[in-house]
């Protein structure tokens, strides 16, 4: 870590220290402590205060980003006196050198790509490194395969997501022989960054009066069940005039995904395709391959 930690403290110090790997703020235990609290204030003056038992001399911040710089503060009362200490945690390094435009997406249920751009003031020899920590086990994943642009890491490909949990902390550190490089960090929910595959096993069966479309929910990285899906069907009559509206049908996920619609014989040639989304986010997948039914002379 290249970040400077600067302490602002009265004479008798609590010796406050912060470990950015574990997000743990700790201080020297005081005898006969009656009250203690820790919190941080970010650049937007938002305060984050984790729960703390009275006899503890440390606290862990679960869901925080540090790249904009934060100030930690510890207050301890003992039966004799009160202690207060601030710890400044700046993002040291030249302004504008941190990775920017950072984003990640999960696809094909078990692959993830993260990409970023080099900072505008970063020197030519800058190199970036991605680390991911999950919220549960605090395990650190180092990027196994970097995507490069002229030798600089500008992305990462992961083909093993077993270390991730529902919410994860992403850190992009930078190094250079010339100057200090700022870091960038971000918290991402896997459910918000997953791009679903389209539904599979799409079939259409017709009788004299109706057609029944069936499909299977896509395999996903998240542990989703049938109610978590929303589907959209595009039933399209072939050889219609340009500008004719497609029929878009919304269908809630069910144990048996099916849509039955009236379509009497003789029926013109139609096509149907389906896409899927998380019912709460509606981040639509691409469309499935179009399935044709009916006949040209219908």
């Amino acid at each position: 870590e290249k970040s400077d930690l600067r302490t602002v403290a009265p004479a008798s110090s609590l010796n406050v220290r912060f470990d950015s790997r574990t997000m743990n703020l700790s201080w020297d235990c005081q005898e006969n402590t009656t009250f203690s609290k820790c919190f941080l204030t970010d650049k937007k003056n938002r305060v984050v205060e984790p729960r703390l038992s009275n006899n503890e001399c440390s606290c862990t911040f679960r869901e925080i980003c540090l790249h904009e710089g934060v100030t930690f503060e510890v207050h301890v009362n003992t039966s004799q006196r009160g202690f207060q200490q601030k710890l400044l945690y700046p993002n040291s390094g030249r302004e504008g050198t941190a990775a920017q435009n950072f984003s990640c997406f999960i696809y094909n249920a078990d692959l993830m790509n993260c990409t970023w751009a080099r900072g505008p003031t970063a020197p030519r020899d800058v190199q970036y490194f991605l680390y991911i920590r999950n919220s549960k086990r605090r395990r650190e994943i180092r990027c196994p395969y970097y995507i490069q642009d002229s030798g600089t890491h500008v992305g990462c490909h992961l083909d093993n997501l077993s270390g991730l949990t529902s919410r994860n902390y992403f850190l992009v550190n930078g190094t250079s022989r010339e100057i200090g490089i700022q870091f960038f960090d971000s918290l991402l929910d896997t459910k918000k960054i997953e791009r679903f595959n389209p539904p599979s096993n799409v079939t259409v069966r017709c009788n004299t009066t109706h057609c029944l479309v069936r499909w299977k929910q896509p395999r996903t990285y998240q542990k989703l069940s049938y109610l978590d899906f929303q589907y959209q069907l595009d039933v399209h009559r072939k050889n219609t005039q340009p500008g004719t509206e497609n029929l878009l049908i919304n269908v809630s996920g069910d144990l048996e995904n099916r849509y039955n619609f009236p379509s009497s014989e003789p029926r013109a040639k139609h096509s149907v395709k389906i896409r899927a989304a998380d019912v709460r986010i509606l981040n639509w997948s691409s469309w499935s391959e179009a399935i044709e039914f009916g006949s040209d002379d219908g």
């Epitope: 529902s166 542990k223 989703l224 069940s225 049938y226 109610l227 978590d228 144990l255 048996e256 709460r280």
Partner: antibody, heavy 120, light 111 residues
Framework: QVQLVQSGAEVKKPGASVKVSCKIS????????IHWVRQTPTKGFEWMGG????????VYAQRFQGRVTMTEDTSIDTAYLTLSSLRSDDTAVYYC?????????????WGKGTMVTVSS | QAVLTQPSSVSGAPGQRVTISCTGS?????????VSWYQQLPGTAPKLLIY???KRPSGVPDRFSASKSGTSASLAITGLQADDEADYYC???????????FGGGTKVTVL
């Protein structure tokens, strides 16, 4: 049409064990997550446990830990609940259910229930 | 004692609108976790009525709607019908606990 068919009512003595079955028809058990919930007039609904795909194992409610066992036989699409060391306050209707969503846990489809009476 | 608090009963005449409240705390509904609602007709198994706070499974009429705000949720039944006479339960999850927690249930009587 997916259905959950549960075994018949049971009368048991205190200290005994009971095994309730839940047969799934119209769908493969291997693609589903089955959870068990019981209902008593005094305590209402109590979640007992079920398959958690995140952990890839069956998880149990703390209060039933050590007394409850949930098993599955995917070859016959049947889930089982065994409750041991029965007490009179275990008298309840026991339901199996298919999870409709994991976040949060939502029971999408329920079996008809199995009445278990514990009486000396 | 149920983790979520519901009124023990509500009633209304046919065609009327009734609402059922479900009050939780900052460690369940307010955490925030989604709420689901179940209907249990006399002598039958529960049936899912609402999930993810306000979504209806296929086959549930749009006379049933629900909402959530802060640490409480509510279920509304409009155009009350005789066959709506049943017990209604809300459910969600609790911080630090696996599985579901339920309300004590509300008996809806159609006058």
């Amino acid at each position: 049409q997916v259905q959950l068919v549960q075994s018949g009512a049971e009368v048991k003595k205190p200290g005994a064990s009971v095994k309730v079955s839940c047969k799934i028809s119209g769908h493969s058990l291997s693609e589903l997550s089955i959870h068990w919930v019981r209902q008593t007039p005094t305590k209402g609904f109590e979640w007992m446990g079920g398959f958690d795909p995140e952990e890839n194992e069956i998880v149990y409610a703390q209060r039933f830990q050590g007394r409850v066992t949930m098993t599955e036989d995917t070859s016959i699409d049947t889930a089982y609940l065994t409750l041991s060391s029965l007490r009179s306050d275990d008298t309840a209707v026991y339901y199996c259910s298919i999870v409709g969503s994991f976040s949060p846990l939502t029971m999408g489809l329920w079996g008809k229930g199995t009445m278990v009476t514990v009486s000396s | 004692q149920a983790v979520l608090t519901q009124p023990s009963s509500v009633s209304g005449a046919p065609g009327q609108r009734v609402t059922i409240s479900c009050t939780g705390s900052g460690s369940n509904i307010g955490a925030p976790y989604d709420v689901s609602w179940y209907q249990q007709l006399p002598g039958t198994a529960p049936k899912l009525l609402i999930y993810h706070n306000n979504k209806r499974p296929s086959g549930v009429p749009d006379r049933f709607s629900a909402s959530k705000s802060g640490t409480s949720a509510s279920l509304a039944i409009t155009g009350l019908q005789a066959d709506d006479e049943a017990d209604y339960y809300c459910a969600t999850v609790e911080d630090g606990l696996s599985g579901s927690v339920f309300g004590g249930g509300t008996k809806v009587t159609v006058l």
